[in-house]
């Protein structure tokens, strides 16, 4: 069985502020078990930006539909979409574990970059 | 708070078909996830299937696959169990139950007990 | 197949750990159900290996590792007297599968 891989296809994502945003994120595997996480930025400081688990992201909606037991596919998107979005998203999967779960692999980043909404 | 209500539990023949219906409450029924579970007497929990929240993906053990059919109406906060071809074996308690992200169970109905006899 | 003690016993306040084997822990969560009598409502005591519901109280947690889960019932009560299955969701096979459930007696 190949190794879980997190892709994430596009380096970078250029959006109009006001505008919704979608970065798109597939896993090669649905083994390990465990949630995936999207965050803003890398390194301790990093911002979270969705948790297949649980929490409550009002901006953000998830492009597939995560119920599937068959899902690959985590892209998200980012309503109203500000200059204060701007940055590196990492899509991230954990593997399960106890009593934290345990960050297994992250893709390679999206660069979201925002432009001034059209006059 | 969650509801699951199940209904529909009757004494049909062998051969005979019935419709479980389930429903829901007290949360958005649209974005979970539901299975049907059931308890044959003096035995344990059986898990027969399972649908995604938008009802487009559905899942069975092998020993109900091509009898039953899961499906939902999400406008109707309703979950249901189609069975055919009822035999003896299905006589059981079934339960509704909502899945969590990771499709186990966080809640379940009360059960309706459909009993199949000559 | 999950795999689980037909039954265990214990003196109120003591610690109960029941088990359950067979599931593959890269691609297993574990869930726990009580049931008080045959044909009730199962209730849900533990869910994604170690996760207690809000409604459950602390006495109980869970555990999984290697290819077993752990119910542990902290301080155990009468009122706790249950048939309590495992059940496990494999990423594999898209299937949720139960142990035959564990008799717990207070004695």
């Known amino acids: 069985e190949d190794e879980l891989q997190v892709i994430q296809p596009e380096k970078s994502v250029s959006v109009a502020a006001g505008e919704s945003a979608t970065l798109r994120c597939a896993m090669t595997s649905l083994i390990p078990v465990g949630p995936i996480m999207w965050f803003r930025g890398a390194g301790a400081g990093r911002e979270l930006i969705y948790n297949q688990k649980e929490g409550h992201f009002p901006r953000v909606t998830t492009v597939s539909e995560l119920t599937k037991r068959n899902n690959l596919d985590f892209s998200i998107s980012i309503s109203n979409i500000t200059p204060a979005d701007a940055g590196t998203y990492y899509c991230v999967k954990f593997r399960k574990g106890s009593p934290d779960d345990v960050e297994f692999k992250s893709g390679a980043g999206t660069e979201l970059s925002v432009r001034a909404k059209p006059s | 708070d969650v509801q699951l209500v199940e209904s529909g539990g009757a004494v049909v023949r062998p051969g005979e078909s019935l419709r479980l219906s389930c429903a829901a409450s007290g949360f958005t029924f649209s974005s979970y996830a539901m299975s049907w579970v059931r308890q044959a007497p003096g035995k344990g929990l059986e898990w027969l299937a399972g649908?995604?929240?938008?009802?487009?993906?559905?899942y069975y053990i092998d020993s109900v696959k091509g009898r039953f059919t899961i499906s939902r109406d999400n406008s109707e906060n309703s979950l249901y169990l189609q069975m055919n071809s009822l035999t003896a074996e299905d006589t059981a308690v079934y339960y509704c139950?909502?899945?969590?992200?990771?499709?186990?169970?966080?809640?379940w109905g009360l059960g309706t007990l459909v009993t199949v006899s000559s | 197949a999950l795999t689980q003690p037909a039954s265990v016993s214990a003196n109120p306040g003591e610690t109960v750990k029941i088990t359950c084997s067979g599931g593959d822990w890269y691609s297993t969560y574990y869930g726990w159900y009580q049931q008080k009598s045959p044909g009730s409502a199962p209730v849900t005591v533990i869910h994604s290996d170690d996760k207690r519901p809000s409604d459950i109280p602390s006495r109980f947690s869970g555990s999984a590792s290697g290819s077993a889960a752990t119910l542990t019932i902290t301080g155990v009560r009468v009122e706790d007297e249950a048939v309590y299955y495992c059940?496990?969701?494999?990423?594999?096979?898209?299937?949720?599968?139960f142990g035959a459930g564990t008799t717990l007696t207070v004695l």
């Open positions: 059940a496990g969701y494999d990423g594999r096979t898209y299937i949720n599968t």
């Open positions: 649908i995604s929240a938008g009802g487009s993906d559905t």
């Open positions: 139950a909502r899945e969590t992200w990771n499709h186990l169970f966080d809640y």
